[in-house]
Amino acid sequence: AAQPNNSLMLQTSKENHALASSSLCMDEKQITQNYSKVLAEVNTSWPVKMATNAVLCCPPIALRNLIIITWEIILRGQPSCTKAYKKETNETKETNCTDERITWVSRPDQNSDLQIRTVAITHDGYYRCIMVTPDGNFHRGYHLQVLVTPEVTLFQNRNRTAVCKAVAGKPAAHISWIPEGDCATKQEYWSNGTVTVKSTCHWEVHNVSTVTCHVSHLTGNKSLYIELLPVPGAKKSAKL
């Protein structure tokens, strides 16, 4: 089957309940063109910030062409949940679906999209829309990766040694320093899937007075700086 090459198309907006909402649908320029009898299986990896709302879309097929629309949801450590709509009888059916935050956007006969209200870490998983037509099935799958913004701290703990921590991020953050020092980085993994990254750096060079910790993460980057306390009795070089 032809495989459309998908690029991310994230739309973010503010809703009434002040939660950012992101919707990932097909980037229309990337659709494969020969779709006569192709049973298309399209999968997209999608990072979504925790505590936002997410909307997942089905392939662009009009309701008049459909027999059944099914959303299949596979979350870690849980039985597969399915939400199905049968057009002929106008009935919806759910199997093993316990999370009330995962729902149809509206009536499935009006909109086949699936929404996740207030995305949590537990929503990490695979979501697939299956559209059954008289001539075969069209699929649209999402590997949903929930992103958690780490809390960043920077402090000096010994002579000319600074510690930068990116606490409970998902995925793990990356820490870099300006200027570079003699650094050691450790990662601590938590049961909920988040990671704490701790970078400890030492600067022997006495003309380094201010250091910056730069934390890179999929949810955004953050920089903090700190003035290194001079070593007692050491001469501090003058800045140009």
């Epitope: 739309q11 659709i31 006569s36 009009a62 062409n65 001539d135």
Partner: antibody, heavy 119, light 110 residues
């Protein structure tokens, strides 16, 4: 390959009915929605409605409701469009067009059937 | 009902130049991230031929001189560069549950 072949030209008197056929080949007939569109001389395209051969569902443009009937014969892979109570302004070329699933686009059209309504 | 308004009604373009046709919908034809707007070319005595689907996708076999853009209510068909055999009528179409065409744009090559 996918093909739609329509019936020949018709001349009808005002008040009469006309039934235009569209024979499909090269695909599973019952799997795809068929639309009907007409075009009066020198005018644009006007959607009349569709029939879904899979379940016999129809949906007509409000303008033609009560005058148009779309049917299908699965044994011959043919759809029909019948327009009744003809008037001179119904003189037009009538086209059938198959809707492709992806994007609801119409990739295959019949060659057109000229219907002339004249007393 | 959604009404589609095309402009201009006609235009004359020299070969090698760019032709731009716009189509405005009375309400959004975009849903779930897709714009259900298509463009067709019709030459005299022939049925329409699909050029662009879902606002910006080139139908198989159509020259890359044709391109489409837009979302929501405003859409554009561009022919660049125009060639002599592009003389035709061009129609935008909204196709989802109730289908509608724009009134057409006649393109003539000078």
């Amino acid at each position: 390959q996918v093909q739609l072949v329509q019936s020949g030209a018709e001349v009808k008197k005002p008040g009469a009915s006309v039934k235009v056929s569209c024979k499909a080949s090269g695909y599973t007939f019952t799997s795809y929605v068929m639309h009907w569109v007409r075009q009066a001389p020198g005018q644009g395209l006007e959607w009349m409605g569709y029939i879904n051969p899979y379940n016999d569902d129809t949906n007509y443009n409000e303008k033609f409701k009560g005058r148009v009937t779309m049917t299908r014969d699965t044994s011959t892979s043919t759809v029909y469009m019948e327009l009744s109570s003809l008037r001179s302004e119904d003189t037009a070329v009538y086209y059938c067009a198959r809707e492709d699933y992806y994007g609801s686009r119409w990739g295959t059209w019949g060659q057109g059937t000229l219907v002339t309504v004249s007393s | 009902d959604i009404v589609l308004t095309q402009s201009p009604a006609s235009l004359a373009v020299s070969p090698g130049q760019r032709a731009t046709i716009t189509c405005r919908a009375s309400k959004s034809v975009s849903t779930s991230g897709y714009s259900y707007m298509h463009w067709y070319q019709q030459k005299p005595g022939q049925p329409p031929k699909l050029l662009i689907y879902l606002a910006s996708n080139l139908e198989s076999g159509v020259p890359a001189r044709f391109s489409g853009s837009g979302s929501g209510t405003d859409f554009t068909l561009t022919i660049n560069p125009v060639e002599a055999n592009d003389t035709a009528n061009y129609y935008c179409q909204h196709s989802h549950e109730l289908d509608r065409f724009g009134q057409g744009t006649k393109v003539e090559i000078k």
